[in-house]
Interface confidence: medium
């Protein structure tokens, strides 16, 4: 199937998320506190259309703050 450049799907999406999120984990949909029910998930945003590093980073898990 045709995919425009700069789109990410499947294993390639997971691999890139691990890189962008520096192994700290990530969400496939943003936490509910940061988005409403109708917000897109990362597959829709990055596989069905193009996305950039800044958008990918919004799906990274938030690191715990130092005590």
């Amino acid at each position: 199937a045709y995919r425009p450049s700069e789109t990410l799907c499947g294993g390639e999406l997971v691999d890139t998320l691990q890189f962008v999120c520096s192994d700290r984990g990530f969400y496939f949909s943003r936490p509910s506190s940061r988005a409403n029910r109708r917000s897109r998930g990362i597959v829709e945003e990055c596989c069905f259309r193009s996305c950039d590093l800044a958008l990918l980073e919004t799906y990274c898990a938030t690191p715990a703050k130092s005590e």
Epitope: E6, E12, S22, D23, R24, P63, K65
Partner: antibody, heavy 115, light 105 residues
Framework: QVELVESGGGLVQPGGSLRLSCAAS????????MSWVRQAPGKGLEWVSY????????GYADSVKGRFTISRDNSKNTLYLQMNSLRAEDTAVYYC????????WGQGTLVTVSS | DIVLTQPPSVSGAPGQRVTISCTGS????????VHWYQQLPGTAPKLLIY???KRPSGVPDRFSGSKSGTSASLAITGLQSEDEADYYC?????FGGGTKLTVLG
């Protein structure tokens, strides 16, 4: 045996362009993301750019965004870095590195930007 | 932004144990996987420790990594002259400033 061999470095004037190559062998090339990492003379390591294993996604350090372009040819097992609008601060040894953990590195190629 | 801080230099005599620290300043390093690289003089970096404490094949067990709180550490036991090198910690895209290890004598 995994081998990464960079080429294409040299002396270039400020504002000029250069294209680096990284030829890979000894592993399934199309299964690994790749990055370019650079090291200015006497300085530490700085990540420059990343490309996903199919080449669908690219990412850049802020210092090179809009000037450098990473690409790969999975039929030739080769990684590229097109560097435009070069500045003196881009002078460095440029390494290609495999995967998301940089588990293998090439020997590096020196890029000198000077008038 | 993530900042990883390493001591500029450490030293030790042959046979001794030395440690190199890597401290995260903007967020808890405990949530990240830390990798360590060794760069011998005039050569390319080499992966030494990945995912905090794992050793790639071929790396002697004299090298070990650990992580606690906001800091990660690389320990080298039974120091040898060939260990003299620069050592870098990283969280994937971000590298520490590097630590120069000098083996005395």
């Amino acid at each position: 045996q995994v081998e990464l061999v960079e080429s294409g470095g040299g002396l270039v004037q400020p504002g000029g362009s250069l294209r680096l190559s990284c030829a890979a062998s000894g592993f399934t090339w199309s299964s690994f993301a790749m990055s370019w990492v650079r090291q200015a003379p006497g300085k530490g390591l700085e990540w420059v750019s990343y490309i996903s294993y199919l080449g669908s996604y690219t990412g850049y350090a802020d210092s090179v965004k809009g000037r450098f372009t990473i690409s790969r040819d999975n039929s030739k097992n080769t990684l590229y870095l097109q560097m435009n609008s070069l500045r003196a601060e881009d002078t460095a040894v440029y390494y290609c590195a495999r995967g998301t953990k940089f588990d293998y590195w090439g020997q590096g190629t020196l890029v000198t930007v000077s008038s | 932004d993530i900042v990883l801080t390493q001591p500029p230099s450490v030293s030790g005599a042959p046979g001794q144990r030395v440690t190199i620290s890597c401290t995260g300043s903007s967020s808890n390093i405990g949530t990240y996987d830390v990798h360590w690289y060794q760069q011998l003089p005039g050569t390319a970096p080499k992966l030494l420790i990945y995912s905090n404490s794992k050793r790639p094949s071929g790396v002697p067990d004299r090298f070990s990594g650990s992580k606690s709180g906001t800091s990660a550490s690389l320990a080298i036991t039974g120091l040898q002259s060939e260990d003299e090198a620069d050592y870098y910690c990283s969280i994937t895209r971000v590298f520490g400033g590097g630590t120069k290890l000098t083996v005395l004598g």
